[in-house]
């Protein structure tokens, strides 16, 4: 049996407010910032997590600036607009009426414009490459052990179906994890690769989104896997539309 009802907390999202006001007095949790009900048996969408993060008091935030290595998501944090399912709206605007189009992981994929900018559809990010460098160890990790442990991590901690972990590459000290998920492959109830990658990124940075205060404990054959830098590359089903001016800058 589970003691979760006694505590009424959300194991998969610490940025929630929970109370036993659901049907039959069941624990119900709502995301900070949006107030949207979340399913605590799975990951919360990145859009709702970003919204919750931006709504948190400034003194409660830790390490909110994006890493200097975040070469792709270089706009960093913003307060996003989410649709009723918690996904990013295709068009995002700030308070000064500057607008841009984003992909399904909330990363800008066009030049910035004004309120007349149109974003016809939310373009799916179907391929995510997570590039890690681990801290020095006594020797290299065994590739097959590393591969198996990372696949198990994504399956058990992030609840991502194994078929979406396309590959794990390793050339000491660089580890690359490839996540692939086309629109046609994603069934109802499947965790989105963008959400899994975001939870993993926050775990690696020591900013776990899970309720427990311990944080990620990842080992390969008992040897801790400690990451010293992370790069995440996003590939969309439709290529992004940036002007040549940006590309040559």
């Amino acid at each position: 049996h589970t003691a979760a009802q006694d505590n009424c907390t959300c194991p998969t999202n610490k940025m929630t407010v929970c109370s036993p006001d659901g049907p039959g007095g069941r624990c119900q949790c709502r995301a900070l910032g949006s107030g949207m009900a979340v399913d605590c048996s799975t990951l919360t969408s990145k859009c709702l997590l970003l919204k919750a993060r931006m709504s948190a008091p400034k003194n409660a935030r830790t390490l909110v600036r994006p890493s200097e290595h975040a070469l792709v998501d270089n706009d960093g944090l913003y307060d996003p607009d989410c649709d009723p399912e918690g996904r990013f709206k295709a068009r995002q605007c700030n308070q000064t009426s500057v607008c841009w189009c984003v992909n399904s992981v909330g990363v800008r994929r066009t030049d910035k414009g004004d309120l007349s900018l149109r974003c016809d559809e939310l373009v799916r990010t179907h391929h995510i490459l997570i590039d890690l460098r681990h801290r020095p160890t006594a020797g290299a990790f065994n590739h097959s052990d590393l591969d198996a442990e990372l696949r198990r991590l994504f399956r058990e901690r992030y609840r991502l179906h194994p078929k979406f972990v396309a590959a794990v590459h390793y050339e000491q000290p660089t580890i690359q994890i490839e996540l692939r998920q086309n629109t046609s492959q994603k069934a109802a109830g499947d965790v989105d690769i963008g959400d899994a990658a975001y939870y993993f990124e926050r775990d690696i940075k020591g900013e776990s989104l899970f309720q427990g205060r311990g944080g990620l404990d990842l080992r390969v054959r008992g040897e801790p896997l400690q990451v010293e830098r992370t790069l995440i590359y996003y590939l969309d089903e439709i290529p992004p539309k940036f002007s040549m001016k940006r590309l040559t800058a």
Epitope: T2, A3, G212, D217
Partner: nanobody, 131 residues
């Protein structure tokens, strides 16, 4: 859903030993921090011992240090508690518990919020220490 089933409790004389076992239904418990708790009439619920998923780090309540040993066999999805030099004050219902999230670092055994980390519980096994 994680399901846990304790066994091995019973009546034992002071100074005696018992070994409790906890069988887990779910393969994913192999990557979860696990713990033993006990409930007594006098003291309420108390954390007894915690073990990380790799089985390399263990944590004990001061009242059982040097007498109890927590261990696990992930190939059998089983948690153990070896109880030696038992005392009458060890009489309690013993529960095994599993952490909410796999690959999560174990909480401190003295953390007042420890129960939040362990939502999955067995039904318990009764240990009675009496002459």
């Amino acid at each position: 859903q994680v399901q846990l089933q304790e066994s091995g409790g019973g009546l034992v004389q002071p100074g005696g030993s018992l070994r409790l076992s906890c069988a887990a239904s779910d393969y994913s418990t192999g990557r979860r921090c696990m713990a033993w708790f006990r409930q007594t009439l006098g003291k309420g619920l108390e954390g007894v011992a915690i073990i990380d998923y790799a089985g390399t780090s263990t944590y004990y309540a001061d009242s059982v240090k040097g007498r109890f040993i927590i261990s696990r066999d992930n190939s059998k999805n089983t948690l153990y508690l070896q109880m030696n030099s038992l005392r009458p004050e060890d009489t309690a219902m013993y529960y095994c518990a599993a952490a909410a999230i796999p690959y999560e670092r174990c909480p401190d055994i003295s953390d007042p919020q420890i129960l939040v980390s362990f939502p999955y519980w067995g039904q318990g096994t009764l240990v009675t220490v009496s002459s």
